[in-house]
Amino acid sequence: EVEKTACPSGKKAREIDESLIFYKKWELEACVDAALLATQMDRVNAIPFTYEQLDVLKHKLDELYPQGYPESVIQHLGYLFLKMSPEDIRKWNVTSLETLKALLEVNKGHEMSPQVATLIDRFVKGRGQLDKDTLDTLTAFYPGYLCSLSPEELSSVPPSSIWAVRPQDLDTCDPRQLDVLYPKARLAFQNMNGSEYFVKIQSFLGGAPTEDLKALSQQNVSMDLATFMKLRTDAVLPLTVAEVQKLLGPHVEGLKAEERHRPVRDWILRQRQDDLDTLGLGLQG
């Protein structure tokens, strides 16, 4: 907490400019009017305030806006955002995607912090759903963002937003999340032709049911083993040897290397030995 002291004569700030970087903490507190700071927030990031001085600026804004900052201030916080706690951020109402982008830019190159998670949560709740533009923005800054959401939160993602999702965005998703995302992806990509459809749907297939895998096996898709290994075990078990052979195409030989791992192990145990022998891979059921 900065002590209340009178501003020395001639030091009262008329505007937010670089002369303030030479002010001591107590001088900043005494000589900078909070309302002036709020109206000239756009200047703050162009001025090389020390990290310590940012504490004083935050303190002034907190006093001026005890119920939470207005968006006109939030959008210009820049490095001041790093001084905010999740509790501070919960008081905000952020509606502009540009404001969100500006604050995410400050955190670029870092893992998601509790502050950023709170900011995103406030923003998405304010919008009511994860629209395509928001998803584009969030996955650009945080490729793992989608997989950080609960299945319940993912249910608010409209199918149109799925077009923004890149394969790497789903790397850390678990089966429950893919169960929610897969039907949306299927709907989003339904008008694409066979090979293009498979390219797009491939990274979502961890949520696909048996009947969709059977349908894919009729389309010469040549699924790679990495994708096959991410399929739901309960969806793979009912597939016949012939269906798996068609699904994997030339990649079927990879089953041998994965015979001790799920879902391959469990699938092998469900098959007749005669059928497995037709693959010529030496798989033992």
Epitope: E18, I21, A46, I47, P48, Y51, E52, D55, Y79, L82
Partner: antibody, heavy 116, light 107 residues
Amino acid sequence: EVQLVESGGGLVQPGGSLRLSCAASGFTISKASIHWVRQAPGKGLEWVASIWPTKGFTTYADSVKGRFTISADTSKNTAYLQMNSLRAEDTAVYYCARGRYWLDYWGQGTLVTVSS
Amino acid sequence: DIQMTQSPSSLSASVGDRVTITCRASQDVKEGVAWYQQKPGKAPKLLIDERERLYSGVPSRFSGSGSGTDFTLTISSLQPEDFATYYCQQYNTWPATFGQGTKVEIK
């Protein structure tokens, strides 16, 4: 991709001058701050100077004040360190780095040797 | 200027060990501390800033903690690629200052 490339190092006699350059790509230096940090052979890191090109604000370590000048040419996206009155103790690898407070990107460094 | 004192200046450890490096500031620097890793002949690399905020691509075995004057970098399970020199830096006030470094060597 963000990159910083230093150049201009070399062997110079005590009392001599050198100008180091730091060419930036993948970001605009006018929206960042650029710092020079040096490391004497077998020693730790020492901050030397910083510039905020937007306002032209500069700051220096006491050990180089009055002898070194940091500057930037935003049209060339390049920062410079003009080193005058060089001393043996200025011998070091000089790195330029980007960052407002912490330094998230560094160049590969350029060696400055001050010796007669 | 704020002095940053690191300890130990060097340590020997084995792969899988938990390693802790401390950094003490001569005055309060709040959360304004970053940690860097440097390998011989290479530039330093940012690991952590804001005392505990992990930089992208840095393995989660690295963590930072502390506040005020005492800060810690912890490597939960040392890996072969972690043998290097580590530096703390305070950026709370100008000039930014670095610790003298801690060299982590193979036992």
